[in-house]
């Protein structure tokens, strides 16, 4: 697995560099996670033909994956920093159960899947420090998450492959939208 942000050789080689600001650290963390997703997607796409399936075909699924909508305040029209930040944190918390599902789905990229999961936890902590309105953030119910996980793991092989692909694609899109909005803050 790649080294987490702030621990790569470039950082070691430049000890006198200015410490990262909170925004820079969040930006770097998201890019690190996106790199991880990219590696996981490579393995998924090599293993199955899901990546060739059209978006429309894949949209017919029962997964309730977090998605950015106009009302969330993360797009340019109706942009709202606080509303958007709440949506990003809430969405990441909702993705955690799906990232847990991914943990046993990879052979050669097992460490990478773990790195994505752990880095997301760190990202949530960074963002919670940035948010003013923590009361507005709803945490998913652990019982509901546990039964969802059981249900996902009980699917047949084809559905599990499709679920893996959908989670990775949706998580990537969510992170991209989140980072674009965060870059406006």
């Amino acid at each position: 697995a790649p080294v987490p942000p702030g621990e790569d050789s470039k950082d070691v080689a430049a000890p006198h560099r200015q410490p990262l600001t909170s925004s820079e650290r969040i930006d770097k963390q998201i890019r690190y996670i996106l790199d991880g997703i990219s590696a996981l997607r490579k393995e998924t796409c090599n293993k199955s033909n899901m990546c060739e399936s059209s978006k429309e075909a894949l949209a017919e699924n029962n997964l309730n994956l977090p998605k950015m909508a106009e009302k969330d305040g993360c797009f340019q029209s109706g942009f709202n920093e606080e509303t958007c930040l709440v949506k990003i944190i809430t969405g990441l918390l909702e993705f955690e159960v799906y990232l847990e599902y991914l943990q046993n789905r990879f052979e050669s990229s097992e460490e990478q899947a773990r790195a994505v999961q752990m880095s997301t936890k760190v990202l949530i902590q960074f963002l919670q420090k940035k948010a003013k309105n923590l009361d507005a953030i709803t945490t998913p119910d652990p019982t509901t998450n546990a039964s969802l996980l059981t249900k996902l793991q009980a699917q047949n092989q084809w559905l599990q492959d499709m679920t893996t692909h959908l989670i990775l694609r949706s998580f990537k899109e969510f992170l991209q939208s989140s980072l674009r909005a965060l870059r406006q803050m």
Epitope: R31, L34, F75, Q76, K172, E173, Q176, S177, L179, R180, R183, Q184
Partner: nanobody, 123 residues
Framework: QVQLQESGGGLVQAGGSLRLSCTAS????????MAWFRQAPGKEREFVTD???????WYADSVKGRFTISRDNAKNTVYLQMNSLRPEDTAVYYC?????????????????WGQGTQVTVSS
């Protein structure tokens, strides 16, 4: 990294329209966020608009409602439709690409740049 080539610049009268194109080669174009920046004589390069991998767009306030960014992944091309042009839109227009598919309003977010195309708006 992708190589970028802009085209479509030229001389146009105020109130007129122009469409810029930027064609990419050497990379998975559909996974990049694409942006347009511009640099007027004696000024710093500034953000105009961008379009993310999933199609979300952002515009600078100065061009909102007049300029439209779009992409054709099959042609590896991003477009900038410029309407109601003003003399202050005169600049060299640069195309830029972000391999993370995110984009943003600052130059540091982009890892590939084109050479630029001149747009001149006369009054």
């Amino acid at each position: 990294q992708v190589q970028l080539q802009e085209s479509g610049g030229g001389l146009v009268q105020a109130g007129g329209s122009l469409r810029l194109s930027c064609t990419a080669s050497g990379g998975t174009f559909s996974e990049y966020a694409m942006a347009w920046f511009r640099q007027a004589p004696g000024k710093e390069r500034e953000f105009v608009t961008d379009i993310g991998e999933s199609g979300g767009t952002w515009y600078a306030d100065s061009v909102k409602g007049r300029f439209t960014i779009s992409r054709d992944n099959a042609k590896n091309t991003v477009y900038l439709q410029m309407n109601s042009l003003r003399p202050e839109d005169t600049a060299v227009y640069y195309c830029a690409a972000d391999s993370y598919g995110v984009g943003g309003g600052a130059e540091r977010y982009y890892d590939s740049w084109g050479q630029g195309t001149q747009v001149t708006v006369s009054s």
